[in-house]
Interface confidence: low
């Protein structure tokens, strides 16, 4: 798949559209002006303190514990409803989510609240689902969940290999750590950093601390951010955006599928995420967050997924001549952007089609066997096979190859699900182009 650029085919008559949202970033400049950025950061930090304390005192209490019961209905603000609510069908009301059953974390125009995650067996519930926050699950004692296999808790090793000594205990997010007695190097050969032996977690429930402690912590974060602003200048938003967008599941995609890695301790406490939600109380679509994006990129016509349908009014004859191409929304590497979404595909592609799909994509039976053997667990199998496919085919591993393979297999609904998911996650968007110039 080519990356979008000056020479990308332009759709005749199409023009750049932003996703529907409450406001547009007007008069965007090539780079952020530092004073304005500083003001935003400071404002964000101050808001963060008050917002966090408000969240703790109000939103995390069960309904019966709140001072005043939340109204069942209220009116949408600029077409969006606040966290803890979803919009009614007619768009006139905001209806509250059901405590303990479903939730919404941001300003939204969801027709339904998202269903609460239930912790798997082998997990403990760290914090319950509220109307504004999903359940947080953590591996039970003696097990851990690592980055490479976020879907399951794995048993911690009981001891270190011969000639090694234990320097770190089993925690819900890491196995025991072992180092060689003589050299002091970890099993992997790295020299252990001091921090690596610390077993406390940012994700464990914080003990009640004074406001001054919060302010000190936040101030440090602010200083770091201010330095970053000066260093990065115009690159700031480009650098921050990938973090803001989160991994594929994090963008309002499949409500059935909650990516567990986003629920691992600390993941939801990302300062960047907090700042964005404060700076954008009405959830400005991601395309509008890139404030220094040139007002009109030359030679390329981008369509946000939410508005692309308005350009699809030509006759069927013309429509058949065109192919709507999925491209990364943030101009990232197409193959890498797709790879970040693989973890979700196991829920979207029927199990019986996993192997036929991989054969269709060019994996040999032996490679499939190896992938199955390497997979951490059943759910991880498709992910592992897809990674093998990417490693094998490199730049040729495109979203369209994958979708076409599903179509060929007759898995049209799986194809639809993945296409929808890639769009609603905010990772991909449509580039309107001619079928004969379709990028793969």
């Amino acid at each position: 798949m080519e990356q979008r650029g000056q020479n990308a085919p332009a759709a005749s008559g199409a023009r750049k559209r932003h996703g529907p949202g409450p406001r547009e970033a007007r008069g965007a400049r090539p780079g952020p002006r530092v004073p304005k950025t500083l003001v935003l950061v400071v404002a964000a930090v101050l808001l963060l303190v008050s917002a966090e304390s408000a969240l703790i005192t109000q939103q995390d209490l069960a309904p019966q514990q709140r001072a005043a019961p939340q109204q069942k209905r209220s009116s949408p603000s600029e077409g969006l409803c606040p966290p803890g609510h979803h919009i009614s069908e007619d768009g006139r009301d905001c209806i509250s989510c059901k405590y303990g059953q479903d939730y919404s974390t941001h300003w939204n125009d969801l027709l339904f609240c998202l269903r609460c995650t239930r912790c798997d067996s082998g997990e403990v519930e760290l914090s319950p689902c509220t109307t504004t926050r999903n359940t947080v699950c953590q591996c039970e004692e003696g097990t851990f969940r690592e980055e490479d296999s976020p879907e399951m808790c794995r048993k911690c090793r009981t001891g270190c290999p011969r000639g090694m000594v234990k320097v770190g205990d089993c925690t819900p997010w890491s196995d025991i750590e072992c180092v060689h007695k003589e050299s002091g190097t970890k099993h992997s050969g790295e020299v252990p950093a001091v921090e690596e032996t610390v077993t406390s977690s940012p994700g464990t429930p914080a003990s009640p601390c004074s406001l001054s402690g919060i302010i000190i912590g936040v101030t440090v974060a602010a200083v770091v951010l201010i330095v970053a602003v000066f260093v990065c200048k115009s690159l700031l938003w480009k650098k921050v955006l990938p973090y803001l967008k989160g991994i594929c599941s994090g963008g309002g995609g499949d409500p059935e599928r909650v990516d567990r890695s986003s629920q691992r301790p600390g993941a939801e406490d990302n300062v960047l995420n907090e700042i964005v939600s404060i700076l954008q109380p009405t959830q400005v679509p991601e395309q509008e967050m890139e404030v220094q994006e040139p007002a009109e990129p030359t030679g390329v016509n981008m369509l946000s997924p939410g508005e692309s349908e308005h350009l699809l009014e030509p006759a069927e004859a013309e429509r058949s001549q065109r192919r709507r191409l999925l491209v990364p929304a943030n101009e990232g590497d197409p193959t890498e952007t797709l790879r970040q979404c693989f973890d979700d595909f196991a829920d979207l592609v029927p199990f019986d089609s996993w192997e036929p799909l991989m054969r269709k994509l060019g994996l040999m039976d032996n490679e499939i066997k190896v992938a199955k053997a390497e997979a951490a667990g059943h759910r991880d199998t498709l992910y592992t096979m897809l990674i093998k496919w990417v490693n094998k085919t490199g730049r040729d591993a495109s979203v369209h190859t994958l979708l076409d393979a599903l179509e060929t297999l007759g898995e049209r609904l799986a194809k639809q699900k993945i296409e929808d998911h890639l769009l609603s996650s905010g990772k991909f968007m449509y580039l309107e182009g001619n079928a004969d110039s379709a990028m793969s």
């Epitope: 027709l111 269903r115 309002g252 409500p255 059935e256 939410g306 029927p350 199990f351 699900k417």
Partner: antibody, heavy 126, light 107 residues
Framework: QLVESGGGVVQPGRSLRLSCAAS????????MHWVRQAPGKGLEWVAV????????YYADSVKGRFTISRDNSKNTLYLQMNSLRAEDTAVYYC?????????????????????WGQGTTVTVSS | DIQMTQSPSSLSASVGDRVTITCRAS??????LAWFQQKPGKAPKSLIY???SLQSGVPSKFSGSGSGTDFTLTISSLQPEDFATYYC?????????FGGGTKVEIK
Amino acid sequence: QLVESGGGVVQPGRSLRLSCAASGFTFSSYGMHWVRQAPGKGLEWVAVIWYDGRNKYYADSVKGRFTISRDNSKNTLYLQMNSLRAEDTAVYYCAREVGYCTNGVCSYYYYGMDVWGQGTTVTVSS
Amino acid sequence: DIQMTQSPSSLSASVGDRVTITCRASQGISNYLAWFQQKPGKAPKSLIYAASSLQSGVPSKFSGSGSGTDFTLTISSLQPEDFATYYCQQYNSYPLTFGGGTKVEIK
């Protein structure tokens, strides 16, 4: 909220066009289905069209003969039935796919069909 | 195509009974399963989506469970208005398919 029309008695090989008028909800935000039920039999899915009309899928038994379409400006769903056969005799229901939408991006595979019309009867007989 | 097999095809029960209907998919469908209730001469009514989630407005006496290939619809305490035909439907892949139906009759 969904009212089907256009049913009737028709001879084999002839054509018929069914309509489904929607009201009470934002029609253009939902995928729509046709489902049929032959006399004394179970339910059979016929076709689906996405909210924007860009994707359409059909049951093998009607592929190439039936065409699903929609006019969002008129809040109406259609089923054009050509080359009708005796086995197409059934009550035809239109049904709304429950959608999950955020920022104008809708996905239609989470919640199934929640709103159904009362049906219109199609009889194919010589 | 994914075949959906419902059992039993019919059952007789009394008011107050606990009734269980099963549905089996010919291949794994995750939790992409819905249950519908249909009364004679009427359109189907959606009861459950995503295998276990209750459609809004549906009484809690209805519950669904299962994932993969085996699914269950349970009516905890049968009431006169519950005598009807129940269908399961998969929406994991096209073509969408329904089970053959289970007719719940008064004993």
